[in-house]
Interface confidence: low
């Protein structure tokens, strides 16, 4: 028979709890062996106190009694063969060497009944405490601290553990944070990164990612300081955080042991989303005015934001939906987080202007606006925090309530009238088109432009193929030549002040079709570029270059 | 089977106290994060407290912080829900439920529900 | 607060989906259940727990799923004795909204 207890003495902190292995192995008898648990103080050492025993509820020595009834000191069994003693809180004076005795259920007295292993209290000194972040300051207030970092910030928290214990311990700390309003309790208590006592530092599985993109450090400096930094803090960064510092010993048997554990809240921290602070406003109001005027729209960006630069960065943007079009509307100008600006789809060719006018105050402005311009405006603003390295990740965005800008119209209408000069025309010979124009209303400076078109028939109809354009004149007088159906030379110009004509020379049979003339109203704004402010088109005129009686 | 019968529900005046006893078994209840859930007649349910494991941390609903204390005892696999000042809309039915952690405050881990206490706050 | 629709309808042998979002983030994840009660006044029935858990005395054509922060109650299969207000349940850091209004299921 062989009675087996750890190898001493075992080292363990006062007000913490231990638990004492025995077990027996070489014995005759039942499986179930008995076990009986005494201690022999320094002051007594050949006294020895009964504690618990497995077989008999009176067994427990009178400084023992009220403990064991409590449940404070037990003996648990593990099997037939081993069991535990658990001391739930240690005192000083159970210092001493602990003796496991297994009454005997040999035929005869063979081998060892008992085992020794001695078990030294030491003071409970492991101290933990908030301490200032910076690497010098003044010690935290006692009662833990309610801070508010900025989304996308650096949340930075320090952590005081040191211990005197006369033995050689090592310390493990980590960093521990729990959900705002939620009750503490051990499940809710989330690691986010933790020093072990040989120094590897380890994250939580949540945080994991974060340590490895150096967005989450922790670092010793001096002796006992230790200092959490979480860079580009998020929402759910929010909550309590907690510093836990555990003392580790060295057992004989080689195996690492927990002595002591510590805890202390360092600081409720909140988190200010961009996203709850983000505002957009602005002016100056409902706008109403003519073509050709400037158009300056102000947009506003507020609220508890961080300053652009090293944690966060916005971008400020106008958008417009015509009037009575649905949906978000497309960009007309935005600047970029760096500044840069940039004209949305169809508005490249304008002279518009967005620029930054004040800290969060930003302008557009088009030089000349056109009744296309009219609609709701918006601006949006987006919110972007700098997360691990130098990536930007959005977080936030905000619109603007709509800002309703109305541009006049220019009350240009147009009518014309196109014919057939000379009313019939032969193959071979030149056909002059006509096309009168009449312009009611109208700023001064109006200049006109005009096209002709062809729809040719098929099999005697007009065919589905949309028409063609064979020439026309500009705004600016230069004219442009389409394509011909029969291939030969076009002429278009200008013959009086509202009077263009279409010259189809050496007539063909694919020449015939149905001809119209599409008159176009434009003004020059002062930044040079041009707007459409009316059109029209003509009735059809018919053209059958008819054959002569001699081309028979 | 795991069970959980509430008792000490009835007729109780505006301003006076109540206390709702659940008892647990089938399960060990020193494991488990217990929380009270109430619905007022013809309404939806409400969350109204919440207790870990141990007992170190309690939380309340807005509408009863102040007024209700959320305690257990794990020995008697009980866990008691005291409300205090009590006004009509106080009125419903009062389920005692189980949640799979120990504790995490979460209503969308509830695993088990009692049958429910009845409480009438009326003059 | 937790946001799930009033009512829906199905015919017996059709599939239901009722939605719940709105619920806060644990973590970074989102957890939901899902409670059946047949009728006012009696004890709800725990359908789903944790998204997709279902305790195993519960039918399977009750299943559960959750992503981006929505969760979704399946009934494949719909069973006359399926009438009945489908609560949701989740994460609320200020503990104000911990359940759904309730979605009320009627097999036509």
């Known amino acids: 028979r062989e009675v087996l207890v750890p190898e001493g003495p075992l080292y363990r902190v006062a007000g913490t709890a231990v638990s004492i292995s025995c077990n027996v192995t070489g014995y005759e008898g039942p499986a179930q062996q008995n076990f009986e648990w005494f201690l022999y103080r320094p002051e007594a050492p050949d006294t020895a106190l009964g504690i618990v025993s497995t077989k008999d509820t009176q067994f427990s020595y009178a400084v023992f009694k009220s403990r064991v009834v409590a449940g404070e000191v037990q003996v648990q069994r593990l099997q037939g063969d081993a069991v535990v003693l658990k001391i739930a809180r240690l005192q000083a004076q159970d210092a001493g060497i602990y003796e496991c005795h297994t009454p005997s259920t040999d035929t005869r007295y063979l081998g060892s009944y008992s085992g020794k292993v001695e078990l030294r209290v030491l003071p409970d000194v492991l101290q933990v405490s908030a301490a200032p972040p910076g690497p010098r300051g003044r010690q935290a207030p006692t009662s833990p601290p309610r801070m508010t970092v900025h989304e996308g910030q650096e949340l930075a928290l320090g952590c005081l553990a040191r211990t005197s214990t006369q033995k050689h311990t090592h310390l493990a700390v980590s960093f521990g944070r729990s959900v705002p309003e939620a009750p503490v309790g051990r499940s809710t208590l989330q690691e986010v990164v933790g020093i072990r006592s040989d120094l590897a530092v380890e994250a939580g599985a949540p945080y994991a990612e974060r340590l490895a993109a150096g967005e989450l450090r922790l670092g010793k400096e001096g002796t006992d300081r230790y200092r959490m930094v979480v860079g580009g803090a998020q929402a759910g960064d929010a909550g309590t955080y907690h510093c836990t510092a555990a003392e580790w010993i060295q057992d004989p048997d080689g195996s690492w042991a927990q002595i002591a554990e510590k805890r202390a809240v360092l600081a409720h921290v909140d988190v200010q989303t961009l996203s709850s602070q983000l505002a957009v406003t602005v002016g100056p109001g409902e706008r109403r005015i003519g073509p050709g005027e400037p158009l300056e729209l102000l947009c506003n960006v507020s609220g508890a934001l961080p300053p652009a630069g090293r944690h966060a960065a916005y971008s400020v943007g106008w958008e417009m939906a015509p009037a009575g079009a649905p949906g978000p509307g497309r960009l007309v100008a935005q600047l970029d987080t760096e500044g840069v600006g940039s004209l949305g789809p169809g508005y490249e060719g304008r002279h518009i202007a967005m620029e930054k006018v004040a800290s969060r105050t930003y302008r557009l402005r088009l030089e000349a606006a056109r009744p296309g311009d009219a609609g709701t405006y918006r601006c949006l603003a987006k919110a972007y925090v700098r997360g691990s390295g130098t990536r930007l990740r959005e977080a936030a965005s905000a619109r603007s309530r709509p800002l309703p800008v109305h541009v006049r119209e220019e009350g240009v209408v147009l009518e014309a009238v196109a014919w057939l000069a000379g009313g019939t025309v032969y193959r071979g010979e030149t056909a002059s088109l006509l096309c009168n124009i009449s312009v009611r209303g109208g700023p001064p400076g109006l200049r006109l432009a005009a096209s002709w078109w062809v729809e040719r028939p098929e099999d005697g109809e007009l065919s589905s193929v949309p028409a063609q354009l064979v020439g026309g004149v500009g705004q600016d007088g230069v004219a442009e030549l389409g394509v011909r159906p029969g291939g030969g030379p076009v002429s278009v110009e200008l013959v009086g002040p509202r009077s263009h004509r279409l010259r189809l020379h050496s007539l063909g049979p694919e020449d015939e079709g149905v001809y119209h003339c599409a008159p176009s109203a434009w003004v020059q704004h002062a930044d040079y570029s041009w707007y459409q402010a009316g059109s029209a088109r003509s009735g059809p005129v018919t053209v059958y270059p008819y054959m002569h009686a001699l081309d028979t | 089977a795991v069970t959980l019968d509430e008792s000490g529900g009835g007729l109780q005046t505006p301003g006076g106290g109540l206390s709702l006893v659940c008892k647990a078994s089938g399960f060990s209840i020193s494991s488990y994060e217990m929380q009270w859930v109430r619905q007022a007649p013809g309404k939806g349910l409400e969350w109204v407290a919440g207790?870990?494991?141990?007992?170190?941390?309690?939380a309340y609903a807005p509408a009863v912080k102040g007024r209700a204390t959320i305690s257990r005892d794990n020995g008697q696999s009980t866990v008691r829900l005291q409300l205090n000042n009590l006004r009509a809309e106080d009125t419903g039915t009062y389920y005692c439920a189980k949640t799979i952690y120990a504790a995490t405050l979460n209503a969308g881990e509830i695993d088990a529900w009692g049958h429910g206490t009845e409480v009438i706050v009326s003059s | 607060a937790l946001t799930q629709p009033s009512s829906v309808s199905a015919n017996p042998g059709e599939t239901v989906k009722i939605t719940c979002s709105g619920g806060?983030?644990?973590?970074?994840?989102?957890?939901y259940g899902w409670y059946q009660q047949k009728s006012p006044g009696s004890a709800p029935v725990t359908l789903i727990?944790?998204?997709?858990k279902r305790p195993s005395d519960i039918p399977s054509r009750f299943s559960g799923s959750e992503s981006g922060s929505t969760a979704t109650l399946t009934i494949t299969g719909v069973q006359a004795e399926d009438e009945a207000v489908y609560f949701c349940?989740?994460?609320?850091?200020?503990?104000?909204?911990?359940f759904g209004a309730g979605t009320t299921l009627t097999v036509l």
């Open positions: 207790i870990d494991d141990d007992g170190s941390s309690r």
């Open positions: 806060g983030s644990w973590y970074g994840s989102y957890y």
């Open positions: 349940g989740g994460y609320d850091s200020t503990t104000t909204d911990m």
């Open positions: 727990y944790n998204n997709d």
